[in-house]
Interface confidence: medium
Amino acid sequence: KAMHVAQPAVVLANSRGTASFVCEYASPGKATEVRVTVLRQADSQVTEVCAATYMMGNELTFLDDSICTGTSSGNQVNLTIQGLRAMDTGLYICKVELMYPPPYYMGIGNGTQIYVIDPEPCPDSD
C-alpha cells in the first residue's frame, strides 16, 4: 500500500561535508516498527546510501560504518549524512516502510537535492 512521504527540495551541505534533512510520512495506522532508507539518484543510477529500522519512540540504529545518523519524532525522521564531498552531490530520496503491524505500507519522497562544495584548501603560510 502506498503512503505519502515529504522532504525538503534542496539542502546545502556544510563546510565539513555534513547535510541534514527531514523526512515526514503520513502514517495510515499505528506503526510500531518503521524502516527508513536513503537512496541516492545521480545520472539515472540509484544506489542505497543507508538504512535503519527503528521502533517508534526509539533512536534510529544504522550500521556502525554508516555515514548516516538520525532521530525520530512522531511521523518524522531527522536524517544527517556525513563525509560528503562534491562528487556526492545528487538527489537523496527518502523511502519509508511501515513494517509492523500489518498491513505493510511504503512511501517514497520526491528527493532532496543535496549540494556539496569541497572547501578550498588553506593556502600555505610562509
Epitope: 512521504v5 515529504a6 522532504q7 525538503p8 527540495a9 527531514v22 510520512y25 503520513a26 519524532s73 511521523n75
Partner: nanobody, 127 residues
Amino acid sequence: EVQLVESGGGLVQAGGSLRLSCLASGRTFSSYDMGWFRQAPGKEREFVAAISWGGVNTYYADSVKGRFTISRDNAKNTVYLQMNSLKPEDTAVYYCARGSAPYSSSRSSAQETYAQWGQGTQVTVSS
C-alpha cells in the same frame, strides 16, 4: 518579515460552503507547519485545523472534523481551508498562522507554537 493574508470569507447560509485562502510572503513557506484558528464574538481564539510542513499530515478540532479540510500548495505559498456543511456556530473571524520552527514535528494545536498570524477574514453563517 513574513506576511500572511487571508481571503475567501463572507456571508453564507447554513449548510453552505466556503473556501478560505492564506497567502504567505517569503521563500520559506514550505518549511513550516500552518494552522487555522478562529475567534467568535465574545469567545477566545480556538484551534481549527493544522497541516504539516510537507502537507502529508493534517489535524482537526473535533468540532470541524469531517466538515473542514485543510490543504496547502507550497508552489503557490498558500494554505487553504475548505469549509462544508457550515453551521451558525462556525461564525467567527478566521486566522491563518505559521508555525514557529522550520520542519517542526510538534504538531501542536497550541497558539503559543505559532509565530506569525494574519489579520483574519470574517465568516458569517446565517440560519
